[in-house]
């Protein structure tokens, strides 16, 4: 396979269903903490979408840590049988659009938007900066694209396409893309490669948003950011399909992915935990 072929492969919904987290902490990286114990624990890996083993140091860390594989699965995975390919005339909203707005338990309040299923509109609320749920968007536009209905009863998706209510076909919306590229994937795909703080030299891939390709880099083994993938294919799956791209000799838009990419980004603003 050439690099170009690989980067233009369309990964279908059946191969990569939308990631819908049951709890925000399931998106946290495995964190062994600063202590030196060797304790077998489990965490949910958002890239492999599975619960995996890791070694916990015995103190601190985060909530993405479970005593058993079963507990991890119970908290962070959904039954694959629930992932039904949608063939109905009107695309359904993601489940999280129907969740109540959730400020979370922290107090670093920032403006976010949620879909109000009563008013059928995206509205502003104050998010505390941690936890909460996925009905939580950084912009009004993002919320509208994912959760609100379009004017003619179609669901506008997050990739500039709409489901045509007449013939059930996906119609590119050229008006949504003012520049050559517009990114609609996970926001971490736009971050630079980050080696992290340790001394290992692990082969990893990051998405280079400037050139629009996945590139190798050396990861130190700890720290860094979410733009960090164990394989090129995983990198492409997560980031490449987030681009809407104009075809060079025409006005149409080619959409790399014809479904919504669910947000799993966690806010890293300064936060203040409430006294429990």
């Amino acid at each position: 396979d050439s690099e170009e072929d690989e980067e233009h492969t369309i990964i279908t919904d059946t191969e990569l269903p939308p990631l819908k987290l049951m709890h925000s902490f399931c998106a946290f990286k495995a964190d062994d903490g600063p202590c030196k114990a060797i304790m077998k624990r489990f965490f949910f890996n958002i890239f492999t979408r599975q619960c995996e083993e890791f070694i916990y140091g015995g103190c601190e860390g985060n909530q993405n840590r479970f005593e058993s594989l079963e507990e991890c699965k119970k908290m962070c995975t959904r039954d694959n049988a629930n992932r039904i390919i949608k063939t109905t005339l009107q695309q359904e909203k993601p489940d999280f659009c129907f969740l109540e707005e959730d400020p979370g338990i922290c107090r670093g309040y920032i403006t976010r938007y949620f879909y109000n299923n009563q008013t059928k509109q995206c509205e502003r609320f104050k998010y505390g900066g941690c936890l909460g749920n996925m009905n939580n968007f950084e912009t009004l536009e993002e919320c509208k694209n994912i959760c609100e209905d379009g004017p003619n009863g179609f669901q506008v998706d997050n990739y500039g396409t709409q489901l045509n209510a007449v013939n059930n076909s996906l119609t590119p919306q050229s008006t949504k893309v003012p520049s050559l590229f517009e990114f609609h994937g996970p926001s971490w795909c736009l971050t630079p490669a980050d080696r992290g703080l340790c001394r290992a030299n692990e082969n990893r891939f990051y998405y280079n948003s400037v050139i629009g390709k996945c590139r190798p880099f050396k990861y130190s083994g700890c720290g860094g950011n979410e733009n960090n993938f164990t394989s090129k294919q995983e990198c492409l799956r997560a980031c490449k399909k987030g681009f809407i791209q104009r075809i060079s000799k025409g006005g149409l838009i080619k959409t790399k992915r014809k479904r919504k990419k669910q947000r799993v980004k966690i806010a890293y603003e300064e936060i203040f935990v409430k006294n429990m």
Epitope: E100, T111, Q118, R124, F125, K126
Partner: antibody
Framework: EVQLVESGGGLVKPGGSLRLSCAAS????????MNWVRQAPGKGLEWVGT????????YYADSVDGRFTISRDNAKNSLYLQMNSLRAEDTAVYYC???????????WGQGTLVTVSS | DVVMTQTPLSLPVTLGQPASISCKSS???????????LNWLQQRPGQSPKRLIY???KLDSGVPDRFTGSGSGTDFTLKISRVEAEDVGVYYC?????????FGQGTKVEIK
């Protein structure tokens, strides 16, 4: 017409408790986050707290956090403020106010007076 | 918390004359979404507060157009082009950009 009517105010001793109610009408109550705001005699306005549309989550001012609890019953179109460990400085007219889609208070009730005194 | 400071605290005006109230915030009220959540309330004597203006300059329905709001960042102004008898009361600015919501001390408008 949007209407918010508070009740339950009265005289209470320091350390005592009181429960205020706000009856809403003229709009779909469950669609809106709701607030309590208070106004001490001859003073300005102070935000007390907010409850989300479904009632699962609340925000509180530091001055009342841990003592006051906001709840709602969407089936009854009612908002509540449970006030415990009351202090003299909690003496005020308490207003309920609706939150609009911009997370801003748009409609206010007529208020109910709470007096904390021995 | 964001401190809201109104001036003057008392404003005696002549009927038919203009009036202006200033409101300053201790930090910018421009939110990360590009909007400025500065609002004005009117509280007539013996009544509950009523929203006049939201998002700096948007008039609530039923509010006469003699009221105008302006400003940006930390400095805001409420103007009444021609004061009428029904405008008597206390006017509060308040901000909804930062949590918790905070209010100005109020400006009492009275007829000379």
């Amino acid at each position: 017409e949007v209407q918010l009517v508070e009740s339950g105010g009265g005289l209470v001793k320091p350390g005592g408790s009181l429960r205020l109610s706000c009856a809403a009408s003229g709009f779909t109550f469950s669609s809106y986050a709701m607030n309590w705001v208070r106004q001490a005699p001859g003073k300005g306005l102070e935000w007390v707290g907010t409850i989300t549309t479904g009632g699962s989550y609340t925000y509180y001012a530091d001055s009342v956090d841990g003592r006051f609890t906001i709840s709602r019953d969407n089936a009854k179109n009612s908002l509540y403020l449970q006030m415990n460990s009351l202090r003299a400085e909690d003496t005020a007219v308490y207003y309920c106010a609706r939150q609009d889609g911009n997370f801003l208070m748009d409609y206010w009730g007529q208020g109910t007076l709470v007096t904390v005194s021995s | 918390d964001v401190v809201m400071t109104q001036t003057p605290l008392s404003l005696p005006v002549t009927l038919g004359q203009p009036a202006s109230i200033s409101c300053k915030s201790s930090q910018s009220l421009l939110d990360i979404d590009g909007k400025t959540y500065l609002n004005w309330l009117q509280q007539r004597p013996g009544q509950s507060p009523k929203r006049l203006i939201y998002l700096v300059s948007k008039l609530d329905s039923g509010v006469p157009d003699r009221f105008t709001g302006s400003g940006s960042g930390t400095d805001f102004t409420l103007k009444i082009s021609r004061v009428e008898a029904e405008d008597v009361g206390v006017y509060y600015c308040w901000q909804g950009t930062h949590f918790p919501f905070t209010f100005g001390q109020g400006t009492k408008v009275e007829i000379k």
